[in-house]
């Protein structure tokens, strides 16, 4: 079901929000040995006109914001998405119960922007 | 005023939508000489569980989708954003009325994904 903000004017500008994810909460505790969880973070907030420098907006996002202003029924605002992501190392059991240490890319949000 | 999706279950999956932008429509015709417009396109659609291969989802987006499923009030779904952008060349007048040819990066959406 949809989980929407009913009053977009009450939403803050696009930014990084802190979020710790426990692998037990995800139900992954039987195959992930370590870590027990990690600071994944997430991006959320409005990408509204005018897009300021903090919003790391692309040229396309600037154009899209203007098109949305004039045609909100047809073109959405740009969305608030990660612009910088980091990897984490995970120790886990593979399908054959071998213990593997692997680096998983793009797991941690370091910065957000309007895209 | 708010602009919300009332029926996100009826929204299509994250994908690229075609959009031609005329510089006259943006009110930029007095300083952009050529082109008259360009195929900017945009991304829109749902990033819902399960994220399939077409959605070019990052590892973080996969994790965020699961966290959203369990905590929809606190963590949004990942958003549908450009994954590949192209440049366009623009001929325009600068502030001193000189004619400039410049390549503007990240102007055209070539592909979308869940981020």
């Amino acid at each position: 079901s949809a989980s929407d903000y009913n009053s977009s004017e009450l939403k803050t500008a696009c930014r990084k929000h802190e979020l710790y994810v426990s692998f037990q909460d995800l139900g992954w505790q039987d195959w992930i040995i370590a870590p027990k969880g990690y600071a994944a973070n997430y991006c959320d907030g409005e990408c509204s006109f005018p897009l300021n420098a903090h919003m790391n907006a692309t040229n396309h996002a600037i154009v899209q914001t203007l098109v949305h202003l004039m045609n909100p029924e047809y073109v959405p605002k740009p969305c608030c998405a990660p612009t910088k992501l980091n990897a984490i190392s995970v120790l886990y059991f593979d399908d054959n119960s071998n213990v593997i240490l692997k680096k998983y890319r793009n797991m941690v949000v370091r910065a957000c922007g309007c895209h | 005023s708010a602009s919300d999706y009332n029926s996100s279950e009826l929204k299509t999956a994250c994908r690229k939508h075609e959009l031609y932008v005329s510089f006259q429509d943006l009110g930029w015709q007095d300083w952009i000489i050529a082109p008259k417009g360009y195929a900017a396109n945009y991304c829109d659609g749902e990033c819902s569980f399960p994220l399939n291969a077409h959605m070019n989802a990052t590892n973080h987006a996969i994790v965020q989708t699961l966290v959203h499923l369990m905590n929809p009030e606190y963590v949004p779904k990942p958003c549908c954003a450009p994954t590949k952008l192209n440049a366009i060349s623009v001929l325009y007048f600068d502030d001193n009325s000189n004619v400039i040819l410049k390549k503007y990066r990240n102007m055209v959406v070539r592909a979308c994904g869940c981020h």
């Epitope: 202003l69 004039m70 045609n71 909100p72 029924e73 047809y74 073109v75 | 005023s1 602009s3 919300d4 999706y5 009332n6 029926s7 009826l10 929204k11 299509t12 005329s22 006259q24 429509d25 943006l26 009110g27």
Partner: antibody, heavy 118, light 108 residues
Amino acid sequence: QVQLVQSGAEVKKPGASVKVSCKASGYSFTNYALHWVRQAPGQRLEWMGWIHAGNGKTEYAQKFQDRVTISRDISAITVYMELSSLRSEDTAVYYCARRQLWLPFDYWGQGTLVTVSS
Amino acid sequence: EIVLTQSPDTLSLSPGETASFSCRAGQIIINRQLAWYQRRPGQAPRLLIYGASNRVTGIPDRFSGSGSGTDFTLTINRLEPEDFAVYYCQHYGGSPWTFGQGTKVEIK
């Protein structure tokens, strides 16, 4: 040809709700947005809100935000505007109108008179 | 919100004459996103002009629009009996869409 046909006139008591329908034909319903505009006696035309018939996205004018709901039924190619907590000032002719990207309202319904009276 | 003010409120003219009336915006309308509508008694508004000066297909060429920025004009040359109606301007460059209060063109 494009046609928007609205439901008939309504008389309502203060505090009640009214639901006006707008049936579309002659174009691809889900590709366009439909707006609602009203005109009270002696007043200017007043925009109330819109719905995109394809994805169900809506936006409402701040003035009506708490009282109006715009919905659609794709199978019936019909859009609805429901206004609640009616008061005498809501007596007006209500119109649905289609809008295309970058353009104004190109086709309008014939209008529905809603009278609010005790 | 862009406030539109039309003048005059009423114009009394005879068939064959030229009607000209104005629509002034409270702030600049970028890209001339201004439309003109005609409304005859008991009918829905009918789009005449968009983009301040572009005539809709099927609208007679006696109707013309002009202007930019904050000042716009609708001119009707050689008034026909069916042109006596109320004319509204509208800003359509995004939410909220706003209308002028209307100019009534009546038979003198």
